[in-house]
């Protein structure tokens, strides 16, 4: 029996929420407060993540799973598992080292995060600008100028959606 037992790791019997305690002859002890083990056979419990400051708790830590954080209002998550919180800006702005700045002319941002992106260049797709762009919205491209020959209606129903980057046949 002793020989068989020595071949098997005694820690493998410890379930999630416990740890194999070196200090107690490798018995399975419950994780102490503010710690967890998400898998069995662990020799230690891990310290629970604390959602402090700009982070707020989305899910409390339990003996078998870590806490999960998100960001307080006015901030949004960045990185795996919301490892960072970044300040929100208004639509039409982007976050710089000096804070939120309006998008430069010719660029837009329709979200509270991310960077300002250039307006679509309608002419690259052989189209014309139907609606001008703003800091918050991209331009809307309309039919190509050739499609707007005299007598043609400029309010024809929109063509079926095409793959981006493909020009009309």
């Amino acid at each position: 029996f002793e020989r068989t037992r020595s071949l098997q790791d005694p820690c493998s019997n410890c379930p999630a929420g416990t740890f194999c305690d070196n200090n107690r002859n490798q018995i399975c002890s419950p994780c102490p407060p503010n710690s967890f083990s998400s898998a069995g056979g662990q020799r230690t419990c891990d310290i629970c993540r604390q959602c402090k400051g700009v982070f707020r708790t989305r899910k409390e830590c339990s003996s078998t799973s870590n806490a999960e954080c998100d960001c307080t209002p006015g901030f949004h998550c960045l990185g795996a598992g919301c490892s960072m919180c970044e300040q929100d800006c208004k639509q039409g702005q982007e976050l710089t080292k000096k804070g939120c700045k309006d998008c430069c002319f010719g660029t837009f941002n329709d979200q509270k995060r991310g960077i300002c992106r250039p307006w679509t260049n309608c002419s690259l797709d052989g189209k014309s600008v139907l609606v001008n762009g703003t800091k918050e919205r991209d331009v809307v491209c309309g039919p190509s100028p050739a499609d707007l020959s005299p007598g043609a209606s400029s309010v024809t129903p929109p063509a079926p959606a095409r793959e981006p980057g493909h020009s009309p046949q």
Partner: antibody, heavy 120, light 107 residues
Framework: QVQLVQSGAEVKKPGASVKVSCKAS????????INWVRQAPGQGLEWMGN????????NYNQKFKDRVTMTRDTSTSTVYMELSSLRSEDTAVYYC?????????????WGQGTLVTVSS | DIQMTQSPSSLSASVGDRVTITCRAS??????LNWYQQKPGKAPKLLIY???RLHSGVPSRFSGSGSGTDFTFTISSLQPEDIATYYC?????????FGPGTKLEIK
Amino acid sequence: QVQLVQSGAEVKKPGASVKVSCKASGYTFTSYWINWVRQAPGQGLEWMGNIYPSDTYTNYNQKFKDRVTMTRDTSTSTVYMELSSLRSEDTAVYYCARMGDPFYYAVDYWGQGTLVTVSS
Amino acid sequence: DIQMTQSPSSLSASVGDRVTITCRASQDISNYLNWYQQKPGKAPKLLIYYTSRLHSGVPSRFSGSGSGTDFTFTISSLQPEDIATYYCQQGHTLPYTFGPGTKLEIK
């Protein structure tokens, strides 16, 4: 803040016993292991054993097993380490040290040390 | 008992240098490896636990890596206050054991 305050230096004769105390403050005394580590002059660190104050569970290094006893007094948040049958090679600084929670088996806070000199 | 060895036993480096100390265990200790700093006449201080985790208040120039039997401790840019002896310690199996130490001096 966490503090471990040890008793003062001792001079003992060979064959005698010494009892070193370690008073803890700044945390829940019964929830953390207290370890004893010694360091002979100019030498490295040697783990002697530990005690869990909540239930007095102890682990002793086999090297000291027959000579060392670790106890605690929860009313004063104090841990004691007694070493008997002293010999000259037991001359060392004796440290108590708290084992961090939740058990990465690292000692995160140390006492200031107690010098025990064994000399005839 | 698990034997811990450290190399070098002593080293001399200049301020700003990158310093590396290695620690080897006589058997697999997973990631249960801790590093301590001890200055003359003082108690040791925990710097790194569980191979690579920085103890609270420890400057980020200290780091650790490794797994199994081979571990590395690094000071990315040596400062005058880093002059000390550094010890590794295994926390995998009783009795817990320390390396013999590496004495770090300034050139």
